[in-house]
């Protein structure tokens, strides 16, 4: 028998730096985790202790934290080249800047092979991106062999910007083949390496014949044996293990996200490849593992940078931005009108000639807006102005509801209206009547939404059977301020960029800013 | 430009050590393994084992452990070889050089100067 | 440990000829190994990695090929520079070993 350790990563989304326990800025020093220094040492650690190591990310390394929007993917390749990592798969983030923005700062500076089996290449790019990322690399382990094939979420087009150059294929139809093409060249060893989520990482080991291992991401899926470590709750046990439709048992794992843990799972093979046992948990990287000095400083030489940017003028507003509890938690404000229509921007994508645009609604907590930005500084707009509006490091996500879940995610939105609470909803792409003297639950009497298969788009009523893409805060998705209604019925999520980041990216393509109030959120007494 | 600087010939006598040493410049000395090559005179090239600058991480071959100690001094981008119990055996000339990549594209592409180590009482 | 058995040993050759160097492998290094080049009293030079990449700045002249067990370096065209010692050297499990090397000398 023969012995691997697979290590894995995946949405580590720019959490270079240690982060406190919920992923967001490290405030407690003692109390904080993660972080690329802290990452190294515990690599290396197990690569002392033992013989056949391989480190892996499963994609979304891109997007996320001031150092993704300063550096653009240059601080992955330095910090992935340095902590060795043996092979990536592609993330839909990754295409967040363009092709472009892939190809110059990661693919050709990373030491390491980036792979997505599903994704091809047409046009000029075909030659342009040769050879930069690959579908499979076999690497040499110790005395042994080990392919790894990558896929990435066939959903990209719709989540990024990879442009019209690139065909996102089926995950299972493009890597059969891949594998099939390993097995010829005697590799009996296989790792399915990918960003589509958990479900897809399932169907994977279920339907491709010849992986053995399947190493995922996207879904930010938490997988524990015995008692988790932390705040997360586990989706199942580490590894997960599918049973195939030719009969093998397939470990599937996953290591939750944004550096936190570092997964860790031994796998047994006989002489044959087939796998006899594996084995594991994700490794929580809390301040018992100190950070590496080497890494550290690099850090922090890096970061330099960071704070000079935060500073430095980002477009300018010639209106009050008013961001004040008192006005976003009880009507609409255009603070909320701003970052709902930077996030509509952030996502416009003209996947088909039918649709305008495959989202046109926004919703988001009035809680979630944290400060006002007063346009008497000169009009200017920094991301430290922008840092204080939201504060909390989340990001602008994508989900599939229904119109029934968006019906009672606005009769929640004012069920105990009056009492500064921060469910009150700020919108894009819709228009919303309320009636407050009804009782909680009832209060909605209007509720159109801007149609996106339409050439001129305008606003019709909500249909409680239709189903509409919004994009939202991650902690609306989650369930946040009581929206569990949403986190329920949800028909499909998925993790969107870095708030801030989407904010300050609308302020500058418009170089100067006036939201208005404009009736997106009216309220009336009587009929209907 | 890249460039490894190797120190210059050493004369040793039977059972005694020698340190030789690997000084980098033009490029990012943490970010790229060094390696040692041997080179008895007249024969081929012999790989001894790698040593990762930024935390002193080393690999060796095994017919080179207990013969040769890897270590470096970042402050200075400088590799560090010594040999230890010296026999005729040990009479060559040795190289670094530097490797990029880690498991994607493997290959020496900058080499040392060479030191010669010649053995004898 | 993998073996790497170069051959010929030798070989003499006048200019503008084309030569070819082999490489066996005793076991599968999967395309993981490079060709150097070695001028008497000189440092080895890298001319050829993953079996057929060419290094930065090498004439095209040279080409490398192969998979498998068996690899091969060829020198079309042979230029007065390209005389001295020959090494393939495989990057599969350690210790990565390096060919006997190959004289090429001018006829």
């Known amino acids: 028998a023969w012995e691997l350790t697979i290590l894995h990563t995946n949405d580590v989304h720019s959490r270079l730096e240690q982060t406190s326990e919920d992923s967001s800025k490290c405030v407690n020093a003692s109390r904080c985790m993660g972080g690329v220094a802290r990452l190294f040492t515990k690599v290396q650690q197990i690569r002392r202790a033992e013989p056949n190591v391989l480190l892996l990310d499963a994609g979304d390394q891109y997007q996320g934290t001031i150092w993704f929007t300063v550096y653009k993917g240059a601080e992955v390749a330095h910090f992935m080249n340095a902590l060795r990592y043996d092979a990536m798969a592609l993330g839909n983030h990754e295409f967040d800047n363009g092709v472009e923005g892939l190809i110059e700062p990661l693919l050709k500076e990373a030491k390491f092979p980036i792979l997505s089996a599903n994704i091809k290449a047409k046009g000029p790019l075909a030659s342009q991106i040769s050879g930069l990322y690959l579908p499979y690399k076999v690497l040499p382990v110790g005395d042994e062999v080990v392919g790894i094939v990558g896929y990435t979420s066939k959903e990209t087009p719709f989540l990024s910007n990879p442009g019209t150059n690139l065909v996102f294929e089926d995950e299972i139809t493009a890597l059969q083949p891949e594998v099939d093409k390993l097995k010829t060249l005697n590799v009996n060893k296989i790792i399915a390496l990918g960003h589509s989520g958990f479900e897809m990482d399932k169907l994977i080991a279920q339907k491709v014949r010849g992986v053995d291992v399947v190493v995922g991401g996207h879904s930010n899926t938490f997988l524990y044996t015995g008692n988790p470590p932390s705040k997360e709750v586990p989706a199942g046990k580490y590894p997960f293990i599918v049973t195939s439709d030719d009969g093998r048992k397939v470990p599937v794992v996953q290591a939750y996200a944004f550096g936190k843990y570092l997964g860790y799972l031994k796998i047994e093979f006989d002489e044959r490849g087939n796998v006899i046992s594996s084995h594991g948990n994700p490794i929580l990287l809390n301040s018992s593992i100190p950070e590496d000095p080497s890494i550290k400083a690099d850090i922090n030489k890096w970061r330099i940078k960071l704070d000079n940017y935060s500073t430095q003028e980002l477009g300018k507003t010639i209106v009050y931005l008013d961001g004040s509890s008192q006005s976003c938690r009880f009507r609409e404000c255009n603070m909320g009108n701003l970052i709902c229509d930077a996030m509509i921007n952030n996502n416009l994508r003209h996947t088909d000639e039918m649709f305008w645009n495959h989202v046109s609604m926004c919703i988001l907590n009035g809680g979630g807006i944290r400060s006002p930005i007063d346009e008497r500084n000169n009009g200017t707009i920094t991301w430290e102005n922008l840092a204080a509006v939201l504060p909390f490091g989340g990001t602008f996500d994508l989900v599939q509801l229904k119109g029934s879940t968006l019906k009672k995610a606005f009769e929640h939105s004012v069920h105990r209206y009056g009492q500064s609470t921060g469910e009150f909803l700020q919108v894009g792409g819709i228009h919303v009547v309320y009636d407050l003297s009804r009782k909680p639950g009832d209060r909605v009497v209007k509720l159109d939404v801007l149609c996106t298969k339409c050439r001129v788009p305008s606003y019709d009523p909500l249909k409680m059977d239709e189903v509409y893409k919004v994009i939202l805060p991650n902690f609306l998705a989650n369930g946040g301020d009581g929206f569990q209604m949403i986190k329920d019925e949800l028909l499909r999520h998925d993790s969107g960029d870095q708030d801030i980041n989407v904010v300050s990216t609308y302020i500058s393509k418009m170089k100067v800013i006036y939201p208005a109030v404009e009736g997106r959120i009216k309220f009336s007494t009587g009929s209907h | 430009q890249v460039q490894l600087q190797q120190s210059g010939p050493e004369l040793v006598k039977p059972g005694a050590s020698v340190k030789l040493s690997c000084k980098a410049s033009g490029y990012t000395f943490t970010s790229y393994d060094i390696n040692w090559v041997k080179q008895r005179p007249g024969q081929g090239l012999e790989w001894i084992g790698w040593i990762y600058p930024r935390d002193g991480f080393t690999k060796y071959n095994e017919k080179f452990k207990g013969k040769a100690t890897l270590t470096v001094d970042t402050s200075s981008s400088t590799a560090y070889m010594e040999l230890h119990s010296l026999t005729s055996e040990d009479s060559a000339v040795y190289f670094c050089a530097r490797k990029e990549g880690y498991r994607g594209d493997w290959y020496f592409d900058v080499w040392g100067t060479g030191t010669t180590v010649t053995v004898s009482s | 440990d993998i073996q790497m058995t170069q051959s010929p040993a030798s070989l003499s050759a006048s200019v503008g000829e084309t030569v070819t160097i082999t490489c066996r492998a005793s076991g599968n290094v999967h395309n993981y190994l490079a060709w150097y080049q070695q001028k008497q009293g000189k440092s080895p030079q890298l001319l050829v990695y993953n079996a057929k990449t060419l290094a930065d700045g090498v004439p095209s002249r040279f080409s490398g090929s192969g998979s498998g067990t068996q690899y091969s370096l060829k020198i079309n065209s042979l230029q007065p520079e390209d005389f001295g010692s020959y090494y393939c050297?495989?990057?599969?499990?350690?210790?990565?070993?390096f060919g006997g090397g190959t004289e090429l000398e001018i006829k």
């Open positions: 050297q495989h990057f599969w499990s350690t210790p990565w070993t």
